[in-house]
């Protein structure tokens, strides 16, 4: 006889990275017929939801109206059908951003490079942090970690056109509290031999639209939320 139900999926909307004082919704998707969902934060019960009618609902939402550093951390959820509880979901790392200061991001040799050249990103933040994070925006977004007193290096190796895209970096005060994002750097990778020297950095949008980006980047990817978040967070760990 089955002792537990399959684990639910957990994700954050619009994103697991939440600017401070902004809202976020933690979603937990279990099974139809679940009479209770529990959200746990850092191992303790945080919130409970009892869907009505349970047979027509397989997902609940826990709303956080005002993100802050106390709300940042690891969340998981479970659900119950009758007396039978599920396995706990994977951990969701909820990160608060826009804390304290803004790092600067530079790329060497420059933002326009030729396929095969080796590229290094440098993230600098003068305030007290020793961990830095580099993110490439987009659906296949991934996070790289770097360490240093005031700056960190992120070598990409010989680049291909797959490295094209917009990059940002953060300073991390702890695993769940990050700085404001840097201005974006758009990396252009070309295969031809045009002169790319002294090509200016070409940000696609200013820093204050980062929130909009977070809202729109996952559009149409509802089913991918848990996978995307889980992949990015594994890299964070």
């Amino acid at each position: 006889q089955q002792q537990t139900l399959p684990k639910p999926f957990i994700w954050a909307e619009p994103h697991f990275m939440v600017p401070k004082e902004k809202q976020v919704t933690i979603c937990c998707q279990g099974n139809y017929g679940a009479v209770e969902y529990q959200l746990h934060f850092e191992g303790s019960l945080f919130a409970v939801d009892r869907p009505k009618p349970p047979e027509r609902i397989n997902k609940v939402q826990f709303y956080i109206p005002d993100m802050n550093s106390r709300m940042a951390g690891q969340y998981s959820c479970i659900y119950r059908v009758g007396e039978l509880w599920s396995e706990p979901s994977n951990l969701l790392d909820l990160v608060v951003t826009e804390m304290y200061d803004t790092p600067t991001l530079s790329v060497h040799p420059g933002p326009e490079v030729i396929s095969g050249e080796k590229v290094t990103f440098y993230c600098r933040l003068d305030t007290a942090t020793s961990m830095f994070l580099l993110l490439k925006e987009g659906r296949s977004s991934h996070v790289q970690r770097g360490y240093g007193k005031v700056q960190a290096e992120f070598p990409l190796g010989p680049v291909t056109t797959a490295h094209r895209g917009t990059y940002r970096c953060f300073g991390s005060y702890n695993n769940h509290a990050w700085s404001f994002p840097s201005e974006p750097v758009k990396l252009l990778v070309t295969g031809d031999i045009e002169n790319t020297s002294l090509a200016p950095e070409d940000p696609t949008f200013p820093a204050d639209t980062w929130g909009t980006y977070l809202l729109t980047t996952e559009t149409g990817l509802q089913k991918d939320h848990a996978l995307w978040d889980h992949t990015a967070q594994n890299l964070l760990r």
Epitope: P109, G110, I114, Y122, R124, P158, S197, L198, E201
Partner: antibody
């Protein structure tokens, strides 16, 4: 056109410091790396370090970390390199080079360390 | 640090001759290699970047290529102003390093 202007020469005493300048024109100074390179008389070239004027990111050759300090003044589009505790080994021509790929070079400043 | 071994250190050649200079990288540098020219008065000019990309204003007789860890600068037909010093420079892995230089002399 792009120009990097450096003073022709500096005469300094052993143990003293010197601050070399490199004034950029003809491009957006804050958008590109600035490198510094050393050439001893009749010898090859050695990379000292680089600075990104916009971000303040600096990267040094470990060999020169305690010798050179790179700074910029964005308002005058000028890069600086301070060399400290000078000895005869520091007598050389020092070049600045603009752009990550060293696209543009200054004429170099000859530093002579002599009592 | 990546060592750049440049050969030959000096080369005598005649006007109109085709010559090649080589730099061997001790580690993988991808295509992150420049060729520089230094005049007797010390003036430095970049000729080639990213292994094979010709700088604007540089004569077409200069070309760059790669074979494995060997990088070459070829001058197809030497002219009088070409008899100066040449250096390779890798900018793949910090500290960026230069080859020892090649002095090109007229025969």
């Amino acid at each position: 056109q792009v120009q990097l202007q450096q003073p022709g020469a500096e005469l300094v005493k052993p143990g003293a410091s010197v601050k070399l300048s490199c004034k950029a024109s003809g491009y957006t100074f804050t958008s590109y790396w600035m490198h510094w390179v050393k050439q001893r008389p009749g010898q090859g070239l050695e990379w000292i370090g680089m600075i990104h004027p916009n971000s303040g990111v600096t990267k040094y050759n470990e060999k020169f970390k305690s010798k050179a300090t790179l700074t910029v003044d964005k308002s005058s589009s000028t890069a600086y390199m301070q060399l400290s505790s000078l000895t005869s080994e520091d007598s050389a021509v020092y070049f600045c080079a603009g752009d990550g790929r060293f696209a543009y070079w200054g004429q170099g400043t000859l530093v002579t360390v002599s009592a | 640090d990546i060592q750049m071994t440049q050969s030959p250190s000096s080369l005598s050649a005649s006007l109109g001759e085709r010559v090649s200079l080589t730099c061997r990288a001790s580690q993988d540098i991808g295509s992150s290699l420049n060729w520089l020219q230094q005049e007797p008065d010390g003036t430095i000019k970049r000729l080639i970047y990213a292994t094979s990309s010709l700088d604007s204003g540089v004569p077409k007789r200069f070309s760059g290529s790669r074979s494995g860890s060997d990088y070459s600068l070829t001058i197809s037909s030497l002219e009088s102003e070409d008899f100066v010093d040449y250096y390779c420079l890798q900018y793949a892995s910090s500290p960026w390093t230069f080859g020892g230089g090649t002095k090109l002399e007229i025969k």
